[in-house]
């Protein structure tokens, strides 16, 4: 790793190291020789999940019911909302941005693995 000018949880600005804002807070103003970094908590439905120097918090993900989504875990100031799919559907991507109906096994095939919230049914030919 290349050398860094600052400690962990600091950043370099105007040739000085300033403290990063803790998760759940955003940067209002950089530190100076005489003042510390100024941070403010994220607002309702916003979050920042790392030590940061962001001036804006990120919006929580919206679990769109029209896409078959529902809230699995409510977001906090330090974490994003986690979406999952409604009963009978599974996520189509790692980030679960949309859902698809579980695939039924066609005649001549049996269920080898049941579908879950994140995986589709795995079918297997009958012997």
């Amino acid at each position: 790793e290349p050398p860094t000018a600052c400690r962990e949880k600091q950043y370099l600005i105007n040739s000085q190291c300033c403290s990063l804002c803790q998760p759940g807070q955003k940067l209002v103003s950089d530190c100076t020789e005489f003042t510390e970094t100024e941070c403010l908590p994220c607002g309702e439905s916003e979050f920042l999940d790392t030590w940061n120097r962001e001036t804006h918090c990120h919006q929580h993900k919206y679990c769109d019911p029209n896409l078959g989504l529902r809230v699995q875990q409510k977001g906090t100031a330090e974490s994003d909302t986690v979406c999952t799919c409604k009963e009978g559907q599974h996520c189509t991507s790692k980030d679960c941005e949309a859902c698809a109906q579980h695939t039924p096994c066609i005649p001549g095939f049996g269920v080898m693995e049941m579908a879950t919230e994140t995986t589709d049914t795995v079918c297997h030919p009958c012997p």
């Epitope: 860094t4 400690r7 962990e8 000085q16 190291c17 530190c31 510390e36």
Partner: antibody, heavy 126, light 107 residues
Framework: QVQLVQSGAEVKKPGASVKVSCKAS????????MHWVRQAPGQGLEWMGW????????NYAQKFQGRVTMTRDTSISTAYMELNRLRSDDTAVYYC???????????????????WGQGTLVTVSS | DIQMTQSPSSVSASVGDRVTITCRAS??????LAWYQQKPGKAPNLLIY???TLQSGVPSRFSGSGSGTDFTLTISSLQPEDFATYYC?????????FGGGTKVEIK
């Protein structure tokens, strides 16, 4: 009371490696960065880098990048500095030095060394 | 890297003298500066940090001043135990850098 006790003197051949230990006592080992500073005979002080014993994170001076490795064993409150591919100009006294407490610093890196090990003389000679 | 230049490199003085050592940084370091005393065969000893704060247990005859690029260590009345080498160190950004040292010798 705070103490940093280093391993004994070493004589090494050029191209070899040396590993110096620094055992801390009298304070919470994981609460303070540990730095390594060396001093060649009759010369000034030269900073080598730091390790955060809590996270294991390190930061090495460019000059030693790729040749130095700083590690720690929190179970025995000991920091280590390994220097590889030794040359004759690596002959020096190597010191570990304790920094200010984690979270103390808000502006600047404010790394001031209030406690030092007794030093370990490493002689590199063929 | 920030270069730290100390002057003089050596000074001859007598017990009771006032001794001043200067340290100049190649770029502004605010007040992030420390002074150490080192005696032969020993590890350095922290005297002053943040340019002017006296480390606990250090005699009040030692004082520090300055900010930005120019700093001073003053020993108001030199004592026999003060004959040693003194180093400044910037603590603004990594890599930490030290001055070349000032040896205070007996006149």
């Amino acid at each position: 009371q705070v103490q940093l006790v280093q391993s004994g003197a070493e004589v090494k051949k050029p191209g070899a490696s040396v590993k110096v230990s620094c055992k801390a006592s009298g304070y919470t080992f994981t609460g303070y960065y540990m730095h390594w500073v060396r001093q060649a005979p009759g010369q000034g002080l030269e900073w080598m880098g730091w390790i955060n014993p809590d996270s294991g994170g390190t930061n090495y001076a460019q000059k030693f990048q790729g040749r130095v490795t700083m590690t720690r064993d929190t179970s025995i409150s000991t920091a280590y500095m390994e220097l590889n591919r030794l040359r004759s100009d690596d002959t020096a006294v190597y010191y570990c030095a304790r920094d200010q407490p984690l979270g103390y610093c808000t502006n600047g890196v404010c790394s001031y060394f209030d406690y030092w090990g007794q030093g370990t003389l490493v002689t590199v000679s063929s | 890297d920030i270069q730290m230049t100390q002057s003089p490199s050596s000074v001859s003085a007598s017990v009771g003298d006032r001794v001043t050592i200067t340290c100049r940084a190649s770029q502004g370091i605010y007040s992030w500066l420390a002074w150490y005393q080192q005696k032969p065969g020993k590890a350095p000893n922290l005297l002053i940090y943040t340019a002017s704060t006296l480390q606990s247990g250090v005699p009040s005859r030692f004082s520090g001043s300055g900010s930005g690029t120019d700093f001073t260590l003053t020993i108001s009345s030199l004592q026999p135990e003060d004959f040693a080498t003194y180093y400044c160190q910037q603590a603004n950004i990594f890599p930490l850098t030290f001055g070349g040292g000032t040896k205070v010798e007996i006149k």
